[in-house]
Interface confidence: medium
């Protein structure tokens, strides 16, 4: 019979012969022959192949590098790659999420109006009168000044947008 010039789906042509492709999650060890089937082996740990293939090496799972602000969203299998996403406070620089951009922290005197999302930066707002922030944070809102009155104390030092009020004891009139 004439040697085939094309093969069925999930087959490949080699040495004028149609061999079965390896299934996802497996790599090619040896091509089929007239007498033997295609030999395939499962991918190792931290490796994958996501298609019917004739690859002799599996692909390494993507590494979600925390140094780039990445974390694992979905762990890879022998048939799928690891999916990375950004740590809270970071957002992806591309659809493939190969690295993240650090969202800005709000400086003292400013609080977080909206925590960063995967697509938007931190929105900071100045602390209004009666509120303060003494930290540099990607998460903290402005905090209200301490109410001295509710503690039966008086304001000894006024608060600012960066500092809380300082409360002290009420002056007692001596007889």
């Amino acid at each position: 019979p004439e040697p085939p010039t094309a093969c069925r789906e999930k087959q490949y042509l080699i040495n004028s012969q149609c061999c079965s492709l390896c299934q996802p999650g497996q790599k090619l060890v040896s091509d089929c022959t007239e007498f033997t089937e295609t030999e395939c082996l499962p991918c190792g740990e931290s490796e994958f192949l996501d298609t019917w293939n004739r690859e002799t090496h599996c692909h390494q799972h993507k590494y979600c590098d925390p140094n780039l602000g990445l974390r694992v969203q979905q762990k890879g299998t022998s048939e799928t790659d690891t999916i990375c996403t950004c740590e809270e406070g970071w957002h992806c620089t591309s659809e493939a999420c190969e690295s993240c951009v650090l969202h800005r922290s709000c400086s003292p005197g400013f609080g977080v109006k909206q925590i960063a999302t995967g697509v938007s930066d931190t929105i900071c707002e100045p602390c209004p009168v009666g509120f303060f922030s003494n930290v540099s944070s990607a998460f903290e809102k402005c905090h209200p000044w301490t109410s001295c009155e509710t503690k039966d104390l008086v304001v000894q030092q006024a608060g600012t947008n960066k500092t809380d009020v300082v409360c002290g004891p009420q002056d007692r009139l001596r007889a």
Epitope: N67, G89, H103, S105, S136, A138, F139, E140
Partner: nanobody, 116 residues
Framework: EVQLLESGGGLVQPGGSLRLSCAAS????????MRWVRQAPGKGLEWVST????????YYADSVKGRFTISRDNSKNTLYLQMNSLRAEDTAVYYC?????????WGQGTLVTVSS
């Protein structure tokens, strides 16, 4: 000079608990968000948890959610990680790090081994 000194690691059986500490010095600890990361033997770094400067906001990797609790004591300049229901896959060297800086400053880490 910024210093981060992790402690509290050790050998623990599966299902057991440990509390890690990170003593910070050389910077105003209470002003910064902080985080824990870990590195399992032969693996890359993995983010574990983040806590905001006052401790109001906390975030966790899915792999530790419900089992680990991050906290801080700003008066003691110390960051903590309470680890419960430990599993073999939690075996790693644990590091604390100042957020948002990437890893400019490293402690020596503390090794947690979960094994029966």
């Amino acid at each position: 000079e910024v210093q981060l000194l992790e402690s509290g690691g050790g050998l623990v059986q599966p299902g057991g608990s440990l509390r890690l500490s990170c003593a910070a010095s050389g910077f105003t600890f209470s002003v910064y968000d902080m985080r824990w990361v870990r590195q399992a033997p032969g693996k890359g770094l993995e983010w574990v948890s983040t806590i905001s400067s006052s401790g109001t906001y906390t975030y966790y990797a899915d792999s530790v959610k419900g089992r680990f609790t991050i906290s801080r004591d700003n008066s003691k300049n110390t960051l903590y990680l309470q680890m419960n229901s430990l599993r073999a896959e939690d075996t790693a060297v644990y590091y604390c790090a100042k957020y948002p800086k990437n890893f400019d400053y490293w402690g020596q880490g503390t090794l947690v081994t979960v094994s029966s």
